[in-house]
Amino acid sequence: KVILDKYYFLCGQPLHFIPRKQLCDGELDCPLGEDEEHCVKSFPEGPAVAVRLSKDRSTLQVLDSATGNWFSACFDNFTEALAETACRQMGYSSKPTFRAVEIGPDQDLDVVEITENSQELRMRNSSGPCLSGSLVSLHCLACGKSLKTPRVVGVEEASVDSWPWQVSIQYDKQHVCGGSILDPHWVLTAAHCFRKHTDVFNWKVRAGSDKLGSFPSLAVAKIIIIEFNPMYPKDNDIALMKLQFPLTFSGTVRPICLPFFDEELTPATPLWIIGWGFTKQNGGKMSDILLQASVQVIDSTRCNADDAYQGEVTEKMMCAGIPEGGVDTCQGDSGGPLMYQSDQWHVVGIVSWGYGCGGPSTPGVYTKVSAYLNWIYNVWKAEL
């Protein structure tokens, strides 16, 4: 049975085996086409999600589709039902929390009272000014809190207590990529992890440990990527894995927060990377122990210089490393998080690509998660 499962796939009606390599090859080899059913699927960017959260105290903003203008949500008459609608619009299914936060003198966007219409937030047309003088601070999910804060050093062994959202993504029980838990059903990783194997069956997720081999595997229901853009072949290196069964959160299994839409990190901002990847470029082996390192944002202009990536780093990517080199993500770290800590930990980047590992002029290049929030929300909504 194990051998059969490893090398063959069972088609139904009529029952017969086909070689596993014929799974997800674009050809219907089973009469009912089930060999092409459980494959990595692409999902378009989709329409603009009409709600978003700002780094200014996680305040809620709503889009007026008629004008294309964004507005801050006034706390006047805001209810739990409206909070749930806002979070559902972003694809969250968990129970949100919200509170009033005072409008600051530098409030830029106009402030409006919010209502609901066909499961979407809208501006209340007949409303008056924002009398409470408060905005809605909304949290759709408790995220980004760990039991232990890492120390700021170069590279060191990591504890799952520090990074409870880190997972190992494995194919045929072999670690291929890292990933991050975003909510009980979803793991964030890189699309290029699935280039070789596009069937969902043999992919598994392992969560809750910092040792590679020691924790139970979780079945995967779906793997979703963005449609390929031939104009920018390295763009869109992002994937979402939907787990077959929701995770139960604990001290060692917790979600990391998505970034805010306006999370603009300036050069030299401190960030963290983690992974079980190669400790030496072009060789060595995977690390059995999770490793962590502190890095910093590297200016995109510097990153695109002639002695570096020569313009290959697009607006949907970011660079991180240390100016003198030597600390970087490497093979096997792909898909793992590039993390920023404010009040909570946020996954601002996904380990994507780079030339070599740890070179001074070629730092790691990461998928900029804030550029894909709309896509993430649309995927989640479609799967609610």
Partner: antibody, heavy 121, light 107 residues
Amino acid sequence: QVQLVQSGAEVKKPGASVKVSCKASGYTFSRYFMHWVRQAPGQGLEWMGWINPNSGGTNYAQKFQGRVTMTRDTSTSTVYMELSSLRSEDTAVYYCARVRIGWLQSPPLYWGQGTLVTVSS
Amino acid sequence: DIQMTQSPSSLSASVGDRVTITCRASQSISTWLAWYQQKPGKAPKLLIYAASSLQSGVPSRFSGSGSGTDFTLTISSLQPEDFATYYCQQSYGFPWTFGQGTKVEIK
């Protein structure tokens, strides 16, 4: 675009009252507080009070309490400022001014063209 | 009431000069401060809000700084159209109060 059009100049006798209008257009009238600010000839700016066009609620500077009344007519998107018991020192240009965004402490961004009220016997 | 004191009350400058106007509040107003420009016979125009946020459409040569009680409006390179009177205004508490104004004249 946002426009605030005020009524024309007035000449009044001491003790009389004056009512200045300010007609708003180009935005949702009920959503933004309207302030009144005056400026005596060659002098600085002086805040008089505000009105909430949605509810009609008002707040006046202590100095004008009892003499000033701010009202609104939602059907015509117009606010009014009436000042009674006029004295010569009330001679000034009176401005209505709409806040930048829809809450109270936002500074005025849009201003009417001003209405000169002259109090003279 | 919160008193707002501007200095100088007037200044003479040439085109291209860097001009600085200060405004002091009688108590802390955080950054609840706006700056206006007014030309003769015209309504005031909002330049800066929240002490340092540039109002959309205002040239970037205007900048504001400060918090608490001391604030500054700077014009980095004075242009012919900048000759006017400038007012600061606090919206920390009612009644709102304005500075007495600073008149910027051609030298």
